[in-house]
């Protein structure tokens, strides 16, 4: 069967976008108006992965570009990457297990937690217009929680 | 020192099944990250990945295996099985189990390997 | 899945010889590419990873470079032990999958 897909934007807590900052970073800023245009609409696939009732393995692809969020070790780091695929092959149920997040709902607030890295978590910065990163922090200073906005087809 | 030792070789008969064990030391097959794959090579030729087992039981494997090879581990023996079902001639060979830490893999540790030949 | 092609199949060498071995994706792999050194009756062993990182212990005559598809291993100056098969491996898609090896022998 197919994978099962939905087109998505996220939005940090505190009300930030996410947008496109060169070919292969997403950073996160406050958008208004016309300008939520530029924000970057994820196509969200369900995959095979360890899954509970508030815990579900979702991959992050950029739709209609062959880029999916991954998490990798750089200089003995995790860190979030934007990853170019081959589209004939992607979205799959069996994603590679850089590539799948835990995506986690507490109080209709989101957490995307590497599958890869546990305790790793997608986050944003407090400050405008900083990259989206992997940071190993829950509850500090930087952002971890999202909503999670449906976008028709 | 890390070691991985595979045993349950032999000879089989086609049709006939075989379950091979890795032992690993010096390590857990629980730490974050940790993955160990299996990876054989028939005489005289090159190296075909079989398999992997994620340290949370996350498993992929080779789709031309898939339906008759099965990766489990017992985390309290930290050993890691490959069962082999519906064998087949061409599945003589070298069978390798190998450690890697996180994707992408490469794989850092290797046993020595144990042989299986399908035969009747 | 991604075909790994590895040139030479066969390559004659001398002791001091610098070595190139080339290994082609069928399509782009990043850097997501692992070098391996296997002797008769062995088990291969890590020589690089991701493209060009020497594994800890391996002596640094052997170098790897290359991006996207194309990929290389150099010996810069051959030693009498380095006379082995030597494989590539893909991790960028699953399944992974190995070159058919490049056997070094002593010309």
């Known amino acids: 069967a197919p994978v099962r897909s939905l087109n998505c934007t996220l939005r940090d807590s505190q009300q930030k976008s996410l947008v496109m900052s060169g070919p292969y970073e997403l950073k996160a800023l406050h958008l208004q108006g016309q300008d939520m245009e530029q924000q970057v609409v994820f196509s969200m696939s369900f995959v095979q992965g360890e899954e509970s009732n508030d815990k579900i393995p979702v991959a992050l692809g950029l739709k209609e570009k062959n880029l999916y969020l991954s998490c990798v070790l750089k200089d003995d780091k995790p860190t979030l990457q934007l990853e170019s695929v081959d589209p004939k092959n992607y979205p799959k149920k069996k994603m590679e297990k850089r590539f799948v997040f835990n995506k986690i709902e507490i109080n209709n607030k989101l957490e995307f937690e590497s599958a890869q890295f546990p305790n790793w978590y997608i986050s944003t910065s407090q400050a405008e217009n900083m990259p989206v990163f992997l940071g190993g922090t829950k509850g500090g200073q930087d952002i971890t929680d999202f909503t999670m906005q449906f976008v028709s087809s | 020192e890390v070691q991985l030792v595979e045993s349950g070789g032999g000879s089989v008969q086609p049709g006939g099944s075989l379950r091979l064990s890795c032992a690993a030391s010096?390590?857990?097959?629980?730490?974050?990250?940790?993955?160990v794959g299996w990876v054989r090579q028939a005489p005289g030729k090159g190296l075909e990945w079989v398999g992997h087992i994620w340290w949370d039981g996350d498993e992929s494997y080779n789709p031309s295996l898939k339906s008759r090879f099965t990766i489990s581990r017992d985390t309290s023996k930290n050993t890691v099985y490959l069962q082999m079902n519906s064998l087949r001639a061409e599945d003589t060979a070298s069978y390798f189990c190998?450690?890697?830490?996180?994707?992408?893999?490469?794989?850092?540790?290797w046993g020595q390997g144990t042989t299986v030949t399908v035969s009747s | 899945e991604i075909v790994m092609t590895q040139s030479p199949s066969t390559l004659s060498a001398s002791v001091g010889d610098r070595v190139i071995i080339t290994c082609r994706a069928s399509?782009?792999?990043?850097?997501?590419l692992s070098w391996y050194q296997q002797k008769p009756g062995k088990a291969p062993k890590l020589l690089i990873y991701?493209?060009?990182k020497l594994h800890s212990g391996v002596p640094s005559r052997f170098s790897g470079s290359g991006s996207g598809a194309e990929f290389t291993l150099t010996i810069s100056s051959l030693q009498p032990e380095d006379f082995a098969t030597y494989f590539c491996l893909q991790g960028k898609m699953l399944p992974w999958t190995f070159g058919q090896g490049t056997k070094l022998t002593v010309k």
């Open positions: 399509q782009d792999i990043s850097n997501y």
């Open positions: 010096g390590f857990s097959l629980s730490t974050s990250g940790m993955g």
């Open positions: 190998a450690r890697n830490r996180y994707d992408p893999p490469w794989f850092v540790d």
């Open positions: 991701y493209t060009s």
